[in-house]
């Protein structure tokens, strides 16, 4: 059978400073069991952008409704974008465990920030 795929359809997104950026991510299966997290950058120095269970991410909201059943849409919106937010964002599926382990990453979406229109 098909293994879960993490789909980030947009290779790049360009947003004007001060606006919101929507980063799209869907998965093709509800298994394996485990959370989705968003990161900026790759490797050990990557920055956690959103983790549904722990942490405080005041600029990030989830696109899908919190009560949506069998949700496979893990897109996020980041508000009040600044040039410091530029980078490549990865949607990552984890396999549940102690601790959770990375299972599969999306291909990434590069966010570029345009100057605020005058």
């Amino acid at each position: 059978e098909e293994e879960l795929q993490v789909i980030q359809p947009d290779k790049s997104v360009s947003v004007a400073a001060g606006e919101s950026a929507i980063l799209h991510c869907t998965v093709t299966s509800l298994i394996p069991v485990g959370p989705i997290q968003w990161f900026r950058g790759a490797g050990p120095a990557r920055e956690l952008i959103y983790n549904q269970k722990e942490g405080h991410f005041p600029r990030v909201t989830t696109v899908s409704e919190s009560t949506k059943r069998e949700n496979m849409d893990f897109s996020i919106s980041i508000s009040n974008i600044t040039p410091a937010d530029a980078g490549t964002y990865y949607c990552v599926k984890f396999r549940k465990g102690s601790p959770d382990t990375e299972f599969k990453s999306g291909a990434g979406t590069e966010l570029s920030v345009r100057a605020k229109p005058s």
Epitope: S29, I31, Q52, E65
Partner: antibody, heavy 120, light 108 residues
């Protein structure tokens, strides 16, 4: 309509083995986690085990004795129970896992259950 | 392991009465609570998930509320078919999934 039908229960002696099956229909079996939940006579509900893809999870009380597995080509969930004990006597329910938003899991469909009795 | 404590253990009520069940978690589970109804000789049936969302086909006399550690299931006007045992379950932190001990609703 979602249907879950358990089979394989019966009476066994302590130390013996039993394999339960759960035939699923009415949903895309291969993309959902599935679970076993049991209920001892006159008692409450106790989670036993969950399987995702090849990821498996067990209650401490059955770890090392029970094995959960699935055959997606047959839409069937299994529970292999070895080294059975008197305290494993219960109705065993097969349940489909469900998720909501970014979190989960709870159980939105249950079979009618199959009774396992462990007695000498 | 998160422990769920349901109270009371038994409720004796008459049809038409308002019924409230309590479920208390030993630690914060946010809104990751489900409620089930089980009638004698039957499998459990999902009523509420995410603390307050009714499952498909569940009558609106059933409602859930709460977050954190304290949760409530309310039946606004008990019908004869509502008698049975009600269980809460947490899915915030697992394994193991844990259930409360149940509240039995009897006819007064």
């Amino acid at each position: 309509d979602v249907q879950l039908v358990e089979s394989g229960g019966g009476v066994v002696r302590p130390g013996e083995s039993l394999r339960l099956s759960c035939a699923a229909s009415g949903f895309s079996f291969s993309i959902y986690a599935m679970s076993w939940v049991r209920q001892a006579p006159g008692e409450g509900l106790e989670w036993v085990s969950t399987i995702g893809a090849d990821d498996t999870y067990y209650a401490d009380s059955v770890k090392g004795r029970f094995t959960i597995s699935r055959d997606n080509s047959k839409n069937t969930l299994y529970l292999q129970m070895n080294s059975l004990r008197a305290e494993d006597t219960a109705v065993y329910y097969c349940a489909k896992d469900s998720t909501v938003g970014w979190s989960g899991d709870f159980f939105d469909y249950w079979g009618l259950g199959t009774l396992v009795t462990v007695s000498s | 392991e998160i422990v769920l404590t349901q109270s009371p253990a038994t409720l004796s009520v008459s049809p038409g009465e308002r019924v409230t069940f309590s479920c208390r978690a030993s630690q914060n589970v946010r809104s990751d609570i489900a409620w089930y109804q089980q009638k004698p000789g039957q499998a459990p049936r999902l009523l509420i998930y995410a603390a307050s969302s009714r499952d498909t086909g569940i009558p609106d006399r059933f409602s859930g509320s709460g977050s954190g550690t304290d949760f409530t299931l309310t039946i606004s006007s008990l019908q004869s078919e509502d008698f049975g045992v009600y269980y809460c379950q947490q899915y915030y932190d697992w394994p193991p999934f844990t259930f409360g001990g149940g509240t039995k609703v009897e006819i007064k």
